[in-house]
Interface confidence: medium
């Protein structure tokens, strides 16, 4: 399992992971105490047939070619959590591991 | 976590799971001894903002709106394995659980 890593200078058109810092302060999300920003990353690019396909299923659907099935799209295939300190709806301070906040790898599925 | 289920008569345009039987025999994939066919399902449909989003990350990327980030796409969010009997490259018969062969749920990511 592998995926491409790119940056803003890359000429890669295929599915790739790009750096992205999410800034909660800039969004005005004041209920998030910490972190105020974090490296989230994102996926972008084209999914040519078979390139970076995560699942055999993707290939099989392409073979079967059912009505309305779009080609695979560039999407996170591995994600990781971050620890966050935030206010919940009852204004209690919560410290917890929030799943799937960081994209570690992108692929076509 | 939930996802929509549709069939060929559905008028649903949003991201949905559709039935699909993959027939290895029809593909001529005779190195697969069994099963000869199985219910794989597939995902299709539109991902309006926030509808069926699997990860908070998807929402955050939409907020940050980086260069080249496409909107979320309709993709498997839960998959399950099937047991398969097949020949490997050395013509040995292998029996094993092959991951991510069946789409159990679709969502936008």
């Amino acid at each position: 399992d592998f995926g491409l890593d790119c940056d803003e200078h890359s000429t890669e058109s295929r599915c790739c992971r790009y750096p992205l810092t999410v800034d909660f302060e800039a969004f005005g999300w004041d209920w998030i105490i910490a972190p105020k920003r974090y490296k989230a990353n994102y996926c972008s690019g084209e999914c040519e047939f078979v390139f970076l396909q995560k699942y055999p299923h993707t290939h099989l659907v392409h073979q079967a070619n059912p009505r309305g099935s779009a080609g695979p799209c560039c999407t996170p295939t591995k994600m990781s959590p971050i620890n966050m300190l935030y206010f919940n709806g009852k204004e209690q301070i919560i410290y917890g591991k929030i799943p799937a906040m960081v994209v570690d790898r992108c692929g076509c599925s | 976590d939930f996802g929509l289920d549709c069939d060929e008569h559905s008028t649903e345009s949003r991201c949905c799971r559709y039935p699909l039987t993959v027939d290895f025999e029809a593909f001529g994939w005779d190195w697969i001894i069994a099963p000869k066919r199985y219910k794989a399902n597939y995902c299709s449909g539109e991902c309006e903002f926030v509808f069926l989003q699997k990860y908070p990350h998807t929402h955050l990327v939409h907020q940050a709106n980086p260069r080249g980030s496409a909107g979320p796409c309709c993709t498997p969010t839960k998959m399950s394995p099937i047991n398969m009997l097949y020949f490997n490259g050395k013509e040995q018969i292998i029996y094993g659980k092959i991951p991510a062969m069946v789409v159990d749920r679709c969502g936008c990511s």
Epitope: - | E25, W31, I33, A34, I93
Partner: antibody, heavy 124, light 107 residues
Framework: QVQLVQSGAEVKKPGASVKVSCKAS????????MHWVRQAPGQGLEWMGN????????NYNQRFKARVTMTTDTSTSTAYMELRSLRSDDTAVYYC?????????????????WGQGTLVTVSS | DIQMTQSPSSLSASVGDRVTITCKAS??????LSWFQQKPGKAPKSLIY???RLVDGVPSKFSGSGSGTDYTLTISSLQPEDFATYYC?????????FGQGTKLEIK
């Protein structure tokens, strides 16, 4: 429907070879194991071996390994069983049988179709 | 090789009777046992697979049971067409081996 049609009866002399054919129809021949089973007159059934037509991979009963060869011709959907160095105790009806996979385990099979049998008589 | 011992080797019964045939393996065969019916001059016909599963189209008067090394075939109410020879087969490992057969005759 699945049909297995075998070649006609043969009379052979001791030491000779015999090649029995089994023509399959009604299914995708290459994707199913074909087995060979024999039955001496008034006796029980004896498994000889199998072959997977897609790639020719075969398993033989050790008892016959030195004398038997199983082959297939995918262009005609035909399986063959050749037995060499025939002896009088090889006189038997030889059956081909398709093995169907029904389940989820590594040995989940049964014989769902049989040929009509080919009588091979070995006599001097 | 796994030895399959079938008993009895022959059995006389009347129409309407319930009969049981047993098959004993020389080692655990993990329920990978099939039963066949054979009539004179004909190819065998599959009845039961995986010890207790009925092949499509086979009447429910045939049933199989057992596990480990001991297995049975039961015919609940004999009809004239059921008089034949019955064989068990183990498919847990190669070589596949059959029992020696049980000839079911009309009393």
């Amino acid at each position: 429907q699945v049909q297995l049609v075998q070649s006609g009866a043969e009379v052979k002399k001791p030491g000779a070879s015999v090649k029995v054919s089994c023509k399959a129809s009604g299914y995708s021949f290459t994707g199913y194991f074909m087995h060979w089973v024999r039955q001496a007159p008034g006796q029980g059934l004896e498994w000889m071996g199998n072959i997977y037509p897609y790639n020719g991979v075969s398993n033989y009963n050790q008892r016959f390994k030195a004398r038997v060869t199983m082959t297939t011709d995918t262009s005609t959907s035909t399986a063959y069983m050749e037995l060499r160095s025939l002896r009088s105790d090889d006189t038997a009806v030889y059956y081909c049988a398709r093995r169907y996979y029904y389940g989820t385990g590594p040995a989940d099979w049964y014989f769902d179709s049989w040929g009509q049998g080919t009588l091979v008589t070995v006599s001097s | 090789d796994i030895q399959m011992t079938q008993s009895p080797s022959s059995l006389s019964a009347s129409v309407g009777d319930r009969v049981t045939i047993t098959c004993k393996a020389s080692q655990d065969i993990n329920s990978y046992l099939s039963w066949f019916q054979q009539k004179p001059g004909k190819a065998p016909k599959s009845l039961i697979y995986r010890a207790n599963r009925l092949v499509d189209g086979v009447p429910s008067k045939f049933s199989g049971s057992g596990s480990g090394t001991d297995y049975t075939l039961t015919i609940s109410s004999l009809q004239p067409e059921d008089f034949a020879t019955y064989y068990c087969l183990q498919s847990d490992e190669f070589p596949l081996t059959f029992g020696q057969g049980t000839k079911l005759e009309i009393k």
